[in-house]
Interface confidence: low
């Protein structure tokens, strides 16, 4: 079902507008900012989000050590480009001609530039490393029941295939999910690691993009857990390209 | 091809305890939940218990409290520990293999299962 | 526990296309998964036929499919065959229990 049939709402991206237009009376959605179709079944793309979400007014141990070659979301919101899939574009610009390259997940990879700019293609994000602290409990959970629960959770609230979570680690009060998706290991229909990790970290938040569902209220054997830093790491199957100037 | 092999059925006394050992082989053995399905004569399928690839542990309402399920993965294989025996957990006992691992709770996941173990409960 | 709706039983003829419904099954997270599991005979080993609301294992023929909508999972047998007639159980995900199956008689 493309959309909540009674109503005519998205229960997967409350950031649409919504109406009974498509073929045979059925509901269709649409994404606020860019007004392309989203299927209401699976999870809009965060290119898609995040150009709906700067459309909408402004008020609304064993751990592992990220690359050398991680990407961290410095830069923040910005209004993205997006193909006609939904996809980041690789290349993004800004109203004053400022350009810069992205990666699957929108992150820029590149310094930034002038409309001369050229990224040929846009790079994979094949692994994300979401970084976790939890608030102090009275006692630290019991790893493989926190391992299954968040299995759990990317499986059932965002869809993504289990085979995608790689693992997950825990040293209280530290939980690392690693989420990996080769572009030859995403079929049709698959939900991209980015968009899971993306939905995730709204409802980290307390931002949830679902339609009246409630927040995310995540139990490990009953016991709530809950977030007090986020931290992820983005990997692209070619590494990033900034000059030296940034690294030092 | 995935085979999975029960072991330790028959006849067993009430209140006394049964222990069932399924070995599984063809597959990657700690990638996978397992766990046990019951089937009473002339009745339907039971869920008994699971375990994930992480180790974490489910029960069916019949046999919690009763039941302990382990694995040992270097062995592929995993037991069902059953105490206080009843006549009503005379049944066919068939071990099953998720097609995931992070979770013990797997009944609409099982793609694989074994021939089965006759266990009858009488004095 | 909760309990899972299947019809008791359904019938059709060689060839034709058969749909067996299940409902009733926990949601988690907004989501609901299925599995359907045949039967020969009662004492006879269970054979996986859909697990995980639609994947089918690769010693099944692709006559057998499942699909979702809401909270009901549907296992549809496009052409059915005299070797198809069987009991097919349902089970839930979250609630971890079986139907109490479906005789399929094929005429």
């Known amino acids: 079902h493309t959309a909540a049939q009674d109503n005519c709402t998205c229960p997967t991206n409350k950031m649409t507008v919504c109406s009974p237009d498509g073929p045979g009376g059925r509901c269709q959605c649409r994404a606020l900012g860019s007004g392309m179709a989203v299927d209401c079944s699976t999870l809009t793309s965060k290119c898609l989000l995040l150009k709906a979400r700067m459309s909408a007014p402004k008020n609304a141990r064993t751990l592992v050590r990220p690359s050398e070659h991680a990407l961290v979301d410095n830069d923040g919101l910005y209004d993205p480009d997006c193909d006609p899939e939904g996809r980041f574009k690789a290349r993004q610009c800004n109203q004053t001609s400022v350009c810069w390259c992205v990666n699957s997940v929108g992150v820029r990879r590149t310094d930034k530039g002038d409309l001369s700019l050229r990224c040929d293609e846009l790079v994979r994000t094949h692994h994300i490393l979401i970084d976790l602290r939890h608030r102090p409990t009275a006692g630290a959970f019991n790893h493989s029941d926190l391992d299954a629960e968040l299995r759990r959770l990317f499986r059932e609230r965002y869809r993504l295939h289990p085979k995608f979570v790689a693992a997950v680690h825990y040293e209280q009060p530290t939980i690392q999910i690693e989420l990996r998706q080769n572009t030859s290991q995403k079929a049709a229909g698959d939900v991209d690691i980015g968009d899971a990790a993306y939905y995730f970290e709204r409802d980290i938040k307390g931002e949830s993009l679902f339609q009246g569902r409630g927040g995310l209220d995540l139990r490990v054997r009953g016991e709530p857990l809950q977030v007090e830093r986020t931290l992820i790491y983005y990997l692209d199957e070619i590494p990033p390209k900034f000059s030296m100037k940034r690294l030092t | 091809a995935v085979t999975l092999d029960e072991s330790g059925g028959g006849l067993q006394t009430p209140g006394g305890a049964l222990s069932l050992v399924c070995k599984g082989s063809?597959?990657?053995?700690?990638?996978?939940?397992m766990g046990w399905v019951r089937q009473a004569p002339g009745k339907g399928l039971e869920y008994v218990a699971a375990?994930?690839?992480?180790?974490?542990?489910g029960y069916g309402a019949a046999v919690k409290g009763r039941a302990t399920i382990s694995k040992d993965t270097g062995q592929s294989t995993v037991r069902l520990q059953l105490n206080n025996l009843r006549a009503e957990d005379t049944a066919t006992y068939y071990c099953?293999?998720?097609?995931?691992?992070?979770?013990?709770?797997?009944?609409?996941?099982?793609?694989?299962w074994g021939h089965g173990t006759e266990v009858i409960v009488s004095s | 526990a909760l309990a899972l709706t299947q019809p008791s039983s359904v019938s059709a003829n060689p060839g034709e296309t058969v749909e067996i419904t299940c409902s009733g099954g926990?949601?988690?997270?907004?989501?609901?998964?299925y599995g359907w599991y045949q039967q020969k005979a009662p004492g006879s080993a269970p054979v996986t036929v859909i697990?995980?609301?639609?994947k089918r294992p690769s010693n099944i023929p692709s006559r057998f499919s499942g699909s979702t909508s809401g909270s009901t999972n549907t296992l549809t047998i496009t052409g059915v065959q005299a070797d198809d007639e069987a009991i097919y159980f349902c089970?839930?995900?979250?609630?971890?229990?079986f139907g109490a199956g479906t005789t399929l008689t094929v005429l």
């Open positions: 099953a293999k998720s097609g995931y691992g992070g979770s013990a709770s797997y009944v609409s996941d099982i793609d694989a």
């Open positions: 063809g597959f990657t053995f700690s990638s996978y939940a």
């Open positions: 375990i994930s690839s992480g180790s974490s542990t």
């Open positions: 926990g949601d988690y997270y907004g989501t609901y998964y």
């Open positions: 697990y995980d609301n639609t």
């Open positions: 089970g839930s995900y979250k609630s971890n229990t």
